[in-house]
């Protein structure tokens, strides 16, 4: 197993709906033909895995069906977007590469980034 | 090192608009937030939003939505807070500080809002 | 809103005492998104704890936090001259992001 570096945005703000996207970006010492990106969540000293998907080079990363993630990827860029966040799922989401294929194995994990998901404010009640 | 420096002291009156800006050295701007506190004289810290440079997006305090607005531009690393319809009970000191991880740090110098007819 | 309320208002201590302050939260608060700040007069605040017990760069070993829940902690273990300041607690777990009112430490 080998390290390599991965690069994430410290903070971002999910929108109004709960949607957070990010790019994690690997430094890819080789050219690997299959990657697989992991999304970690950390709270609380807990690690969860959030979702993960496995794509070979120039094409579009498949996540299952029920998964909360979207990913595009580009060179040694995955743009990944996380759903259905609520207040409660703030947290560290931490992006974890492995350079499948061909050998030798590469893997890579990212500081995290701090995802601050704000609930909307619930709308007063009006009249008609 | 990681740097913010706001811009100067501002004197406004009732009903008007003052725009406070906030510029970041030392770091990746858009990978951070930046907040903005207000103090106003011998008073307590009080947060008012913030925005993740990264996308844009904002969290602004309740009490003064729809009169507030943060942006940031990217491209001079530069913050911004702009606080409308100005009252007497808004001269105060305002900070911008970084937002992390977990944690607001550091914070820049503060900029003095006087609100007087 | 969480409100956050501390305790002192105000401490008198003399230097190379002990100063303990409170701050208690009118909900649980992740201790991940607790912090100290020290503000100095003229001065701004200034970050101290993070993550209810991590000290930020730089800040010197004589400060600790604790706590968890609702219930945390600013121990300052021996108190110098510079100490005498005040001391806000701060959440931002859940918004809006909230300060306490703050303990003011001052010379006995």
């Known amino acids: 197993c080998k390290a390599m570096h991965v690069a994430q945005p410290a903070v971002v703000l999910a929108s109004s709906r709960g949607i957070a996207s990010f790019v994690c970006e690997y430094a890819s010492p080789g050219k690997a033909t299959e990657v697989r990106v992991t999304v970690l969540r950390q709270a609380d000293s807990q690690v969860t895995e959030v979702c993960a998907a496995t794509y070979m080079m120039g094409n579009e990363l498949t996540f299952l069906d029920d998964s909360i993630c979207t990913g595009t990827s580009s060179g040694n860029q995955v743009n990944l977007t996380i759903q259905g966040l609520r207040a409660m799922d703030t947290g560290l989401y931490i992006c974890k590469v492995e350079l499948m294929y061909p050998p030798p194995y590469y893997l890579g994990i990212g500081n995290g980034t701090q995802i601050y998901v704000i609930d909307p404010e619930p709308c007063p009640d009006s009249d008609f | 090192q990681v740097q913010l420096v706001q811009s100067g002291a501002e004197v406004k009156k009732p009903g008007a608009s003052v725009k406070v800006s906030c510029k970041a050295s030392g770091y990746t701007f858009t990978s951070y937030g930046i907040s903005w506190v207000r103090q106003a004289p011998g008073q307590g810290l009080e947060w008012m939003g913030w925005?993740?440079?990264?996308?844009?997006?904002?969290n602004y305090a309740q009490k003064l939505q729809g009169r507030v607005t943060m942006t940031t531009d990217t491209s001079t690393n530069t913050a911004y807070m702009e606080l409308r319809s100005l009252r007497s009970d808004d001269t105060a000191v305002y900070y911008c500080a970084r937002v992390g991880a977990n944690w607001f740090d550091p914070w820049g110098q503060g900029t003095l809002v006087t609100v007087s007819s | 809103e969480i409100v956050l309320t501390q305790s002192p208002g105000t401490l008198s201590l003399s230097p190379g005492e002990r100063a303990t302050l409170s701050c208690r939260a009118s909900q649980s608060v992740s201790s991940s998104y607790l912090a100290w700040y020290q503000q100095k007069p003229g001065q701004a605040p200034r970050l101290l704890i993070y993550?209810?017990?991590s000290r930020a760069t730089g800040i010197p070993d004589r400060f600790s936090g604790s706590g968890s829940g609702t219930d945390f902690t600013l121990t300052i273990s021996r108190l110098e001259p510079e100490d005498f300041a005040v001391y806000y607690c701060?959440?931002?777990?859940?918004?809006?992001?909230?300060f306490g009112p703050g303990t003011k430490v001052d010379i006995k």
């Open positions: 993550g209810a017990s």
């Open positions: 701060q959440q931002y777990g859940i918004s809006p992001f909230t």
């Open positions: 925005i993740s440079a990264y996308n844009g997006n904002t």
